[in-house]
Amino acid sequence: VPLSRTVRCTCISISNQPVNPRSLEKLEIIPASQFCPRVEIIATMKKKGEKRCLNPESKAIKNLLKAVSKEMSKRSP
């Protein structure tokens, strides 16, 4: 579950549950930095702009990332 306006990491809880790529508005992958020592993945859903933090270590989430990047490479000229 995301928490906005934090000075450190954004995600307070993380989910192992995959999301349907078709229901995704945006998928943010925030690399580790001086502010937050871990990678964070934040899914924004089309429905009401709902946000959800995903577990980068989860197999289901890794598969989601592969599917999304595959879809993006299809779209790029």
Epitope: S4, R5, R8, I12, S13, I14, S15, K47, K48, N55
Partner: antibody, heavy 121, light 109 residues
Framework: QVQLVESGGGVVQPGRSLRLSCAAS????????MHWVRQAPGKGLEWVAL????????YYADSVKGRFTISRDNSKNTLYLQMNSLRAEDTAVYYC??????????????WGQGTTVTVSS | EIVLTQSPGTLSLSPGERATLSCRAS???????LAWYQQKPGQAPRLLIY???SRATGIPDRFSGSGSGTDFTLTISRLEPEDFAVYYC??????????FGPGTKVDIK
């Protein structure tokens, strides 16, 4: 089943310390942010503190900032609240609660039964 | 800090009646971050509604939430005997503290 069990409450004198524990079971504790919420006798709910799933983020209510410390041990599936410099107004039932990890929204979806802290001379 | 005000303080109704509880915020709250809880005497609170309008797991459909911005409502369409309790709203997610409202007590007329 999903469960939170608090312990460590009791009667303590003003100015003294107490450590509360919350044992979690039935879910992936290491994925879940955790809260402490308290309720003074006959009063409403007051949010006390929050810790992120990996312990990096900590947040406190102004009323306890500098006196209380929230921590967790993911290897033991346990949440803690270290309470120092206790005051009479800290007398309350203390609940631990899970931040809902699976939904798109926030909320505290699992609560313990509470442990009572009484600060009295 | 966002302050939540709940009204009325006490609602006296009979089983089968409709209950309408109000929660007002001192500044705008994203509807994604407004929750309602039920608490019975001697028990821990229970999450009823999250995201202002979504029912939590196992919550009967007589409970519904609505609203946006600064005004939110919890409605119990037909009160059952087990619904007489205290109800709290909570704003959550902009930044701490995650304040609760003072509560509305629904008691038997």
């Amino acid at each position: 089943q999903v469960q939170l069990v608090e312990s460590g409450g009791g009667v303590v004198q003003p100015g003294r310390s107490l450590r509360l524990s919350c044992a979690a079971s039935g879910f992936t504790f290491s994925n879940s942010g955790m809260h402490w919420v308290r309720q003074a006798p006959g009063k409403g709910l007051e949010w006390v503190a929050l810790i992120g799933f990996d312990g990096i983020n900590e947040y406190y209510a102004d009323s306890v900032k500098g006196r209380f410390t929230i921590s967790r041990d993911n290897s033991k599936n346990t949440l803690y609240l270290q309470m120092n410099s206790l005051r009479a107004e800290d007398t309350a039932v203390y609940y631990c609660a899970r931040d809902w990890p699976e939904g798109y929204y926030n909320g505290m979806d699992v609560w313990g039964q509470g442990t009572t802290v009484t600060v009295s001379s | 800090e966002i302050v939540l005000t709940q009204s009325p303080g006490t609602l006296s109704l009979s089983p089968g009646e409709r209950a309408t509880l109000s929660c007002r915020a001192s500044q705008s709250v994203s509807s994604s971050y407004l929750a309602w809880y039920q608490q019975k005497p001697g028990q821990a609170p229970r999450l009823l509604i999250y995201g202002a309008s979504s029912r939590a797991t196992g919550i009967p459909d007589r409970f519904s939430g609505s609203g946006s911005g600064t005004d939110f409502t919890l409605t119990i369409s037909r009160l059952e005997p087990e619904d007489f309790a205290v109800y709290y709203c909570q704003q959550y997610g902009s930044s701490p503290p995650f304040t609760f409202g003072p509560g509305t007590k629904v008691d038997i007329k």
